[in-house]
């Protein structure tokens, strides 16, 4: 998220970023760090009880931006944030469930943090 | 007043099963989710999942995978944790713990159950 | 998992005291974390939550602050009753994760 007054002069960013990885680490990343040419992502979803589980890890440049633009899909609870400033900025992100339409409670009270929507960092 | 009230203390062999119950009261037991966690003797404290207990959904962390089970009397508001194929290491207090509807901090505990696995 | 380092782990401490707990989260919490009360042979207290909201009934002399991955907990004048193990827990992700405790004795 840019800050008031913040530059948006693009910055130069590493060619390998290291990101940090969680639950979403390939089999070559050593102590919980993945690198790519892409972007470093952070995303929270609820697995089937409603638990919010978050996991991190890299994304290559690829379809990363299709990724990271987090369009929402029905019936999914997920948040995606991605970030390319600097060697594991993921671990700064904060991602959060979208708050619930009142429809949803019809389904029951499902648990999720009723937090507003985050966009993703570039 | 809200209160969760957990069965007695529990001494068991290894290789045994047991069922812990947690008994609701005071509020609506299908509104609030019902968590457990383990405290070893002299040890912190280790969230192992939870029950939805609208959904009947459980989930548990990676390291209470396998041997435990969460379920639910609906009808008698209240929670249960299985423990199968007891070991040493199971030797804890286990509390039953709510917590509120789209949050995740516990805001009312169970008295707590001692459950000793010793041959 | 997510890791809570929680310091220091014991703490001498006199009535009148002002005492100062913190737990830092090895990945960003926003304000989703939690302190707990624990006396010995009792169950745990939930004192405060989201970070710095003081839960039902819980003496104003227990505050909470912090954002991110660094957080406090005070008690701004320390009694007798205070004495107690006191634990941070991170509640944004699966699984919540507690600190190692801080223990409060008197010297």
């Known amino acids: 998220k840019k800050e008031d007054g913040e530059s948006t002069a693009p910055t130069a960013r590493p060619k390998v970023l290291r990101c940090k990885c969680h639950h979403h680490c390939p089999e070559d990343s050593v102590n919980n760090i993945c690198s790519t040419d892409g972007y470093c992502f952070t995303m929270i979803e609820e697995d089937d009880s409603g638990t919010p589980v978050v996991t991190s890890g890299c994304l290559g440049l690829e379809g990363s931006d299709f990724q990271c633009r987090d369009t929402p899909i029905p019936h999914q609870r997920r948040s995606i944030e991605c970030c390319t400033e600097r060697n594991e900025c993921n671990k700064d992100l904060h991602p959060t469930l979208p708050p619930l339409k009142d429809r949803d409670f019809v389904d029951g009270p499902i648990h999720h943090k009723h937090h507003h929507h985050h966009h993703h960092h570039h | 007043q809200i209160q969760l009230v957990q069965s007695g203390p529990e001494l068991k062999k290894p290789g045994e099963t047991v069922k812990i119950s947690c008994k609701a009261s005071g509020y609506t037991f299908t509104t609030y989710g019902m968590n457990w966690v383990k405290q070893a003797p002299g040890k912190g404290l280790k969230w192992m999942g939870w029950?939805?207990?609208?959904?009947?959904?459980?989930s548990s962390a990676d390291d209470f995978k396998g041997r435990f089970a969460f379920s639910l009397e609906t009808s008698a508001s209240t929670a249960y944790l299985l423990i199968n194929n007891l070991k040493n290491e199971d030797t804890a207090t286990y509390f039953c713990a709510r917590s509120e509807l789209r949050n995740w901090y516990f805001d009312v505990w169970g008295t707590g159950t001692t459950v000793t696995v010793s041959s | 998992s997510f890791v809570m380092t929680q310091t220091p782990k014991f703490l001498l401490v006199s009535a009148g005291d002002r005492v100062t707990i913190t737990c830092k989260a090895s990945q960003n919490m926003g304000h989703d974390v939690a302190w707990y009360q624990q006396k010995p042979g009792q169950s745990p207290k939930l004192l405060i939550y989201?970070?710095?909201n003081r839960y039902t009934g819980v003496p104003d002399r227990f505050t909470g602050s912090g954002y991110g991955t660094d957080f406090t907990f005070t008690i701004s004048t320390v009694q007798a009753e205070d004495l107690a193990v006191y634990f941070c827990q991170q509640d944004y992700s699966s699984p919540f994760t507690f600190g190692s405790g801080t223990k409060l004795e008197m010297k």
């Open positions: 029950i939805n207990t609208y959904s009947g959904v459980p």
């Open positions: 989201s970070a710095s």
